[in-house]
């Protein structure tokens, strides 16, 4: 969408699970009628390079009042409709992974899971939900980001050498929170600030470094609008 | 082209019934959901009622609900409205109008409109 | 249901002159508003669908913003042909519902 004309973000990691929430506020009236219930999600992928823009799918062809160097929108699709009797369509080779929460969608939502989600599952997504007398809607944009952690110096180290691991994940806005964690047999250990272990922000510097600290080290990114990210390094020390 | 031609309008008595028909042309009819909209002479448009393309699901202004029927006969590729218990506030210009999209509530084609006057 | 509301109610301006319509929801509707456009006698055309995309075939000095609860209609260089009313309308949620209209009136 044009800037100005912006839907709620939902951000999700690629290659992990990503729900898509939708959770319209239905009259209490309604509540014993969503077995009935019907909903189809569709998908509006985020625009390419330019090129000749696809026709509507359905009706005339749409034009996004915005600038002539936008790329054109990608034809959107039904990811996956349920009908009333529970019958279901999409389209392949997305719906194998995706779900409907079938006892959730009795409670009134109707999150679309994607297990895993992909790069190409970024874009706008809109959930038309059709209940016995009124239909509602969600919209809402999905952005997909990397996660990675990363060491300097990389590889195996030796002990007494200095390494710093930095955890990253590719979305504009700093995290509003990092934790880093060891996972040691009993489970995960928290990482405090210590003579061997000093934080910054997304940063975990270990200035002397031994056999001890070979072995998985991870962090959680927390942001703002609650998405939570977790990454794990291998650390390799060399006796 | 792309065609909505509603016909059935006319003048009625407070209490009567008429009832509205909608002949579509230039597209697959059973393809899309359809809606009825009215606009009282020098006011607003008003919403009155919507079908989904495959008949399951539909939809009335409480102003309408329990008076009004919309039906579709896909093989005729026609829609109608049924309205019974017809009262002075309905007169209108009855508008048959094409749904996006069944998931996407806004109003791509219009027809021309037929007027329903209701007056003793 | 969710209230549409207009301003102004009416406008008079000039051919070339940029025009802009607002349009205020009772609720939060995200993107989910259209604009129409109507002559006198005449249906209502669709212009501006999902707050920012033009419909086919329509000129692109129109062109619409907003999200949440404020949406805008503007039109950038006034044309002979653009003296209407105009009326937005939600279409996040049943029942489906329409601004009352903003009459463009020649100065």
């Known amino acids: 969408l044009q800037p100005g004309a912006e839907v709620p973000v939902v951000w999700a990691q690629e290659g992990a699970p990503a729900q898509l929430p939708c959770s319209p506020t239905i009259p209490l009236q309604d509540l014993s009628l969503l077995r009935r219930a019907g909903v189809t999600w569709q998908h509006q992928p985020d625009s390419g390079p330019p090129a000749a823009a696809p026709g509507h799918p359905l009706a005339p062809g749409p034009h996004p009042a915005a600038p002539s160097s936008w790329g054109p929108r990608p034809r959107r699709y039904t990811v996956l409709s349920v009908g009333p009797g529970g019958l279901r369509s999409g389209r392949l080779p997305l719906q194998p992974r995706v779900q409907l929460d079938e006892r959730g969608r009795q409670r009134g939502d109707f999150s679309l899971w994607l297990r895993p989600a992909r790069r190409a599952d970024a874009g706008e997504y809109r959930a038309a939900v059709h209940l016995r007398d009124r239909a509602l809607s969600c919209r809402l944009r999905l952005r997909l980001g990397q996660a990675s952690m990363t060491a300097s110096p990389p590889g195996s180290l030796r002990a007494s050498d200095w390494v710093i691991l930095n955890c990253s994940f590719s979305r504009p806005d700093r995290p509003a929170s990092v934790h880093w964690f060891r996972n040691r047999g009993q489970g995960r250990v928290p990482v405090r600030e210590s003579p061997h272990h000093h934080l910054a922000e997304s940063f975990l510097f270990l200035p002397q470094v031994s056999p001890m600290d070979s072995g998985p080290w991870g962090c959680i990114l927390t942001y703002r609008d609650g998405f939570n990210v977790s990454i794990m390094y291998n650390l390799t020390v060399l006796g | 082209q792309v065609q909505l031609v509603e016909s059935g309008g006319g003048l009625v008595k407070p209490g009567g019934s008429l009832r509205l028909s909608c002949a579509a042309s230039g597209f697959t009819f059973s393809s899309y959901a359809m809606s009825w909209i009215r606009q009282a002479p020098g006011k607003g448009l008003e919403w009155v009622s919507y079908?989904?393309?495959?008949?399951?699901?539909?939809y009335y202004a409480d102003t309408v609900k329990g008076r009004f029927t919309i039906s579709r006969d896909d093989a005729k590729n026609s829609l109608y409205l049924q309205m019974n218990s017809l009262r002075a506030e309905d007169t209108a210009v009855y508008y048959c109008?094409?749904?996006?999209?069944?998931?996407?509530?806004?109003?791509?084609?219009w027809g021309q409109g037929t007027l329903v006057t209701v007056s003793s | 249901d969710i209230q549409m509301t207009q301003s102004p109610s009416s406008v008079s301006a000039s051919v070339g002159d940029r025009v802009t319509i607002t349009c205020k929801a009772s609720?939060?509707?995200?993107?989910?508003v259209a604009w129409y456009q109507q002559k006198p006698g005449k249906a209502p055309k669709l212009l501006i669908y999902?707050?920012?995309y033009r419909y086919t075939g329509v000129p692109s000095r129109f062109s619409g913003s907003g999200s949440g609860t404020d949406f805008t209609l503007t039109i950038s260089s006034l044309q002979p042909e653009d003296f209407a009313t105009y009326y937005c309308?939600?279409?996040?949620?049943?029942?489906?519902?329409f601004g009352q209209g903003t009459k463009l009136e020649i100065k």
């Open positions: 999902s707050a920012s």
């Open positions: 079908v989904t393309s495959g008949g399951d699901y539909i």
């Open positions: 109008t094409r749904v996006a999209y069944d998931y996407e509530w806004y109003f791509d084609v």
């Open positions: 609720q939060d509707v995200t993107t989910a």
């Open positions: 309308q939600q279409h996040d949620s049943s029942p489906w519902t």
